[in-house]
Interface confidence: medium
């Protein structure tokens, strides 16, 4: 333990300037003090000052108040340091002396005389509050205050607890009045050596070396280290655990860099044409009338839509067309007739009906013929009645739809499920695609229908075609072919045109 007993002398009154022996001081009592501090004694006895002793310089003559903090070489308050556990009790002897000699070192002067003395015995707890007291005898009065405080770095009721504040690698704390540690802001732990990470920093995926920091462990990122890092090179995919690459909708391949929905992502078809996906970066554009080209970017001849009626001939102009009408017709599209029923204008057995008091006519056409003069044979495919890419064919008075694989019905509107007959062996997952079923095989099997059992290094036999890269180890006994542009399939064996379901796991 370590502490200091402090004594503040405030006022001494000796109005008659008398000594303890009844004599008076000439010209006045030049007063200094001797203080002796020792262990508690019920009856104060002479002997060593076991807790310490101190003397002052001359502080005044007869009566005076002590206001200076330094009086010559002395100090006020007077300091009595100790290097032991404060016992809580003490005995104190304060003696006032007169000296005829030196002001600063009166102890050394001969002829010093006692003026008065007081003895205090009692208990005193450690604390900052001063205990104020005064003692009188017949001739003098002394006002004083005293307290016990701990030395720097010592704490507790008896100044026995050592605590030195620090802010370094070994701890970040201050000391409480009882000597316990009080962590500085941002630190925790028994010795305040563990930083408190940024609020919300993921407990497992993040850590910190100083407060309000969040350093991510491998595979994690973000301010709070709660976002996984996907596989390096993952283009259009996400992860739920590090190094994963789960493809976004419409993307496929090991790195989710193969576009399965080129139509939506790139809108390559122009002029209102319809876009159909057909595999990675594969698509077809179905043009509206009047347009052609791979992307329907080319406008056809303005006459391509046969705008001239009643046998009129069409001539292209810079931004439009011009109809040359046959005799008896006029108008922009030769739609107006100067003929009447008398001119027998209806062909193919059409019946003529007069209109507007005989100034014009209308033809009622027999089946399979159309046009204002029944001059055109009906094409039943002009309304595009076949769905899902079916081809329309005129068959005499009717038409039929020739359906693409996987579709049926009068208008190819019904989808045939190739997976209904469970073509995938060994628990393979079946995917219905336009050109037939495709199997995704479980670990240890490969082949179009998962019929081949793998018993060796899956890539050793070079299963990937067309320059594709083979990967193993992604899951036991599996290999993955990363196809070059223009090829798809579990082994990259198919040129673009067969839409796959990715990833291809053989």
């Amino acid at each position: 333990g370590s502490g200091i007993f402090q004594l503040r002398l405030q006022e001494f009154v000796n109005q008659r300037g008398m000594l303890a022996n009844g004599q008076s001081c000439e010209p006045g009592c030049r007063t200094f003090f001797r203080i002796c501090l020792k262990h508690f004694q019920a009856t104060f006895s002479e002997g060593p000052c076991t807790f310490g002793n101190v003397s002052t310089p001359v502080l005044g003559t007869n009566s005076f108040v002590v206001r200076d903090k330094n009086s010559g070489s002395g100090r006020n308050p007077l300091q009595l340091p100790f290097n032991f556990t404060w016992p809580g009790t003490f005995s104190l002897n304060i003696q006032a002396w007169h000296t005829p000699g030196d002001d600063l070192r009166p102890e050394t002067s001969p002829g010093n005389s006692l003026i008065s003395q007081i003895i205090i015995q009692g208990s005193l707890a450690v604390g900052k509050i001063w205990r104020t007291d005064e003692q009188n005898d017949t001739l003098t009065r002394l006002s004083y205050s005293y307290r016990v405080i701990c030395s720097d770095n010592y704490y507790g009721e008896s100044c026995s607890r050592l605590c030195k504040k620090r802010d370094d690698h070994f701890g970040h704390y201050e000391c409480q009045p009882d000597g316990s540690l009080s962590c500085l802001p941002g630190w925790t732990g028994k010795y305040c050596d563990q930083p408190i990470c940024l609020s919300g920093c993921h407990e497992q995926n993040g850590y910190c070396s100083k407060p309000d920091e969040c350093i991510c462990r491998p595979g994690w990122q973000g301010r709070l280290c709660n976002e996984c890092i996907p596989h390096n090179g993952c283009r259009h995919g996400t992860c739920s655990i590090p190094w994963q690459c789960a493809c976004d909708e419409g993307w496929g391949g090991l790195f989710c860099d193969q576009d399965l929905n080129y139509c939506t992502h790139h809108s390559p078809c122009k002029n209102g044409s319809t876009c159909s996906n057909s595999g990675p970066k594969g698509y077809t554009c179905t043009c509206l009338p009047g347009y052609t080209g791979e992307h329907c970017e080319l406008g056809l001849s303005k006459c391509a839509s046969n705008p001239c009626r009643n046998g009129g001939s069409c001539k292209d102009q810079e931004n439009s067309y011009h109809c040359l009408c046959p005799p008896g017709y006029y108008g922009q599209h030769c739609e107006h007739s100067t003929l009447t029923c008398a001119d027998s204008p209806c062909f193919n057995g059409g019946s003529c009906r007069e209109r507007n008091q005989g100034s014009s006519y209308a033809c009622e056409c027999p089946p399979n013929f159309t046009g204002s003069n029944c001059e055109k044979k009906v094409d039943r495919c002009t309304s595009n009645p076949c769905a899902n890419g079916g081809q329309c064919q005129n068959r005499g008075p009717s038409r039929t739809c020739r359906c693409r694989p996987g579709f049926t019905g009068t208008h190819c509107e019904l989808h045939i499920s190739d997976c209904a007959r469970s073509p995938c062996a060994h628990g393979g997952t079946c995917h219905d695609l336009e050109n037939g079923p495709v199997c995704t095989c479980p670990a240890g099997f490969s082949g179009r229908r998962c019929e081949v059992r793998i018993t060796h290094d899956a890539c050793a036999s070079g299963p990937c075609f067309n320059g594709a890269t083979c990967y193993t180890g992604l899951s036991p006994n599996n290999f993955v072919c990363n196809c070059p542009y223009g090829f798809v399939g579990s082994r990259c064996e198919f040129p673009v045109g067969l839409p796959p379901s990715f990833p291809w796991v053989a």
Partner: antibody
Framework: EVQLQESGPGLVKPSETLSLTCTVS??????????WGWIRQPPGKGLEWIGD???????YYNPSLKSRVTISVDTSKNQFSLKLSSVTAADTAVYYC?????????????WGQGTLVTVSS | SYELTQPPSVSVSPGQTASITCSGQ??????ASWYQQKPGQSPVLVIY???KRPSGIPERFSGSNSGDTATLTISGTQPMDEADYYC?????????FGYGTKVTVL
Amino acid sequence: EVQLQESGPGLVKPSETLSLTCTVSGGSISSSSYYWGWIRQPPGKGLEWIGDIYYTGSTYYNPSLKSRVTISVDTSKNQFSLKLSSVTAADTAVYYCAREEAILGGGSDYWGQGTLVTVSS
Amino acid sequence: SYELTQPPSVSVSPGQTASITCSGQRLGDKYASWYQQKPGQSPVLVIYEDSKRPSGIPERFSGSNSGDTATLTISGTQPMDEADYYCQAWDRDTGVFGYGTKVTVL
């Protein structure tokens, strides 16, 4: 909360004695922890310490005023008083009473609101 | 008799630091106190025992005392700090005040 209140005449004739009383409330004037002092401030000038008293009756005065000043205490009324004799126009000032810490360096922590005393015939 | 000398005035911009000095022979051997006084009001103790602040006094007020000079520092000065400031010390049994410094916040 300790409060101090000065009272006394605001006008004193030259050569007469100025008398002021300070009443202490909210605390005992008999505390051994405090002295009770008087300070004055002439109009537009600085503060001047006049003197103080301990509850036991010990007094301390400004040497420049010592011959004219008397400070006394009445512990039964919780009051202390100032008398300044032979006043002149130079004694015109606001007079404050204050509580001074007896312990070293404590300063005057509570003051009255002050009372203006004018010396004039 | 003992004298304490202060500059008559100090000017400071808001938010800046104002320093007021108080000089006296071996002033560092004595305890210095500082008082703030606004027009028409009683003085208020702002620093005692050289550097201690009474409760209720803002932390921007601080003090020091060594050698022959005590200093009152007001850091981050605010318009409300515009006032007269007096230092005070004890010469044996006698209280002594400085002449006062007028602090103006520009």
